[in-house]
């Protein structure tokens, strides 16, 4: 017996052909002897089978000896045994019809699980492959399950559903919501205004939520909100601001806030979360603000960072062309009794610039 | 002899209405699915919309909720209803029979008549 | 969606050549496509269906043949009446598409 797997929700074509090529009376039935359609001359007609609307055949074929069975909009029920009868033989055809669905909806935040559900139809004992979007394989029985999604999970998942040898492809788009990047820091020397850019990791027609950011300064004892606000099909609109720092925020995605000036007391990390409608669990992105100062004071050159700095961070003072004259890692360095011209204070990760401040000291008469 | 005759065709302005009809002979009109099948001035055949013997019917992305395909059985006659026409549908638009249903192909078809749509 | 890529978009040939137009379909279309003629004016007469089954009154240097996603229109000898336009249609499901066509011309 032949046997042929067919999709939930997709076409299956069965096919039948008879020895003579040319159109001869045949008749499809199913295991009860239902009929479902047949011929009558050149004109299709259906038996009272629960196929009716749904089956259908090609009638171009027929002068060929072909006379193939459509059925259309699979559902798991559809698993049967089809019989074709045509020229006195009878030609029998397993169709094995399975479901592949998401339990949830395709839409997951990052961290949560994914679990995928196979239907399939009593007797049958098929085997699940799935593959991620990253290539990572999982197999399964009934249900696969994935827990903490990443973003590289975001894509087509693409399951084989393998039973009597033969097997069908389902093709599943998991989408999993997060921000671009779990961290950013920014470098900025004192009075520069301030950018904080938070891209999403995905696209979607609508998007309703509010979200929020909190801001541990490095100076203060405790995190404080620093703007609340909401998100309407991708519009953005500030429900509530600090008076310091008065907070700018743009009114398209990305979600963009502007600090109108970097200062001492606002360096720090912050949280963005992100609450969407009709998803349990948040959105994060963590923004770290590091703010440098040079001063000159008397005789004493003095270049300070504040904020979330590595421990492997640079900090130097140099005379702008030579050698540097201070290079420690701290979070500041002094020149006692500075020669007069262009100095550089240079935050650096192993060679490379992040920070930059230049100050020019006058000669002393 | 199978024969299909299509009218109603004309110049209409964006944004309006018109119904196509075809009528059709010397088959049995009932046993086949029928399409519509459109050509704008220097292009190619374009599928607009079908309908088969039990009266489903199957559109095209281009047209689907502004055009309408159905089928009169008693009077041998197939119909487009289209609105919310824009320049873009200006064409001649063909009926045709299929071989049989809707898995068939278009094996017959009229001379068609056309759709013009400007202000 | 299937598309239909058809080719070459036209074609000059002479009296008595054998010509090949081809149609790629972007999936499988399991051997279900026609093909059609249609002279200036005039609707589309089929000539061929289900890949190489000629339509009744069709001549028999037309010839078809393919699987999968490539097929071919062959004319063995070209004939004055077959400078026309010519298309593919896929009817492997109902959402039917057709090849941009291909004009042959006199050379």
């Known amino acids: 017996k032949k046997v042929v797997l067919g999709k939930k929700g997709d076409t299956v074509e069965l096919t039948c052909t008879a020895s003579q090529k040319k159109s001869i009376q045949f008749h499809w039935k199913n295991s009860n002897q239902i009929k479902i359609l047949g011929n009558q001359g050149s004109f299709l007609t259906k038996g009272p089978s629960k196929l009716n609307d749904r089956a259908d055949s090609r009638r171009s074929l027929w002068d060929q000896g072909n006379f193939p069975l459509i059925i259309k909009n699979l559902k798991i029920e559809d698993s049967d045994t089809y019989i074709c009868e045509v020229e006195d033989q009878k030609e029998e055809v397993q169709l094995l019809v399975f479901g592949l669905t998401a339990n949830s909806d395709t839409h997951l935040l990052q961290g949560q699980s994914l679990t995928l559900t196979l239907e399939s139809p009593p007797g049958s004992s098929p085997s699940v492959q799935c593959r991620s979007p990253r290539g990572k394989n999982i197999q399964g029985g009934k249900t696969l399950s994935v827990s903490q999604l990443e973003l590289q999970d975001s894509g087509t998942w693409t399951c084989t559903v393998l039973q009597n040898q033969k097997k069908v492809e389902f093709k599943i788009d998991i989408v999993v919501l997060a921000f671009q990047k779990a961290s950013s820091i920014v470098y900025k020397k004192e009075g520069e205004q301030v950018e904080f850019s938070f891209p999403l990791a995905f696209t979607v027609e609508k998007l309703t939520g509010s979200g929020e950011l909190w801001w541990q300064a490095e100076r203060a004892s405790s995190s404080k909100s620093w703007i609340t606000f909401d998100l309407k099909n991708k519009e953005v609109s500030v429900k509530r601001v600090t008076q310091d720092p008065k907070l700018q925020m743009g009114k398209k995605l990305p979600l963009h806030l502007t600090l109108p000036q970097a200062l001492p007391q606002y360096a720090g990390s912050g949280n963005l979360t992100l609450a969407l409608e009709a998803k349990t669990g948040k959105l994060h992105q963590e923004v770290n603000l590091v703010v440098m100062r040079a001063t000159q004071l008397q005789k004493n050159l003095t270049c300070e960072v504040w904020g979330p700095t590595s421990p492997k961070l640079m900090l130097s003072l140099k005379l702008e062309n030579k050698e540097a004259k201070v290079s420690k890692r701290e979070k500041a360095v002094w020149v006692l009794n500075p020669e007069a011209g262009m100095w550089q204070c240079l935050l650096s990760d192993s060679g490379q610039v992040l920070l930059e401040s230049n100050i020019k000291v006058l000669p002393t008469w | 002899e199978v024969q299909l005759l299509e009218s109603g065709g004309g110049l209409v302005q964006p944004g309006g209405s018109l119904r196509l009809s075809c009528a059709a002979s010397g088959f049995s009109f009932s046993n086949y699915a029928m399409s519509w099948v459109r050509q704008a001035p220097g292009k190619g055949l374009e599928w607009v919309a079908s309908?088969?013997?039990?009266?489903?019917?199957f559109y095209a992305d281009s047209v689907k909720s502004r055009f309408t395909i159905s089928r009169d059985n008693s009077k041998n006659t197939l119909y487009l209803e289209m609105n919310s026409l824009r320049a873009e549908d200006t064409a001649v638009f063909y009926c045709?029979?299929?071989?049989?249903?809707?898995?068939?192909?278009?094996?017959?078809w009229g001379q068609g008549t056309t759709v013009t749509v400007s202000s | 969606d299937i598309q239909m890529t058809q080719s070459p978009s036209s074609l000059s040939a002479s009296v008595g050549d054998r010509v090949t137009i081809t149609c790629r379909a972007s999936q499988d279309i399991n051997k279900y496509i026609a093909w059609y003629q249609q002279k200036p004016g005039k609707g589309p007469k089929l000539l061929i269906h289900y890949t190489s089954t000629l339509h009744p009154g069709v001549p028999s240097r037309f010839s078809g043949s393919g699987s999968g996603t490539d097929y071919t229109l062959t004319i063995s000898s070209l004939q004055p009446e077959d400078f026309a336009t010519y298309y593919c249609?896929?009817?492997?499901?109902?959402?039917?598409?057709f090849g941009q066509g291909t004009k042959l011309e006199i050379k």
């Open positions: 249609l896929q009817y492997d499901n109902p959402l039917y598409t």
């Open positions: 309908i088969n013997e039990g009266g489903s019917t």
């Open positions: 045709s029979r299929h071989y049989g249903g809707s898995y068939d192909p278009m094996d017959y």
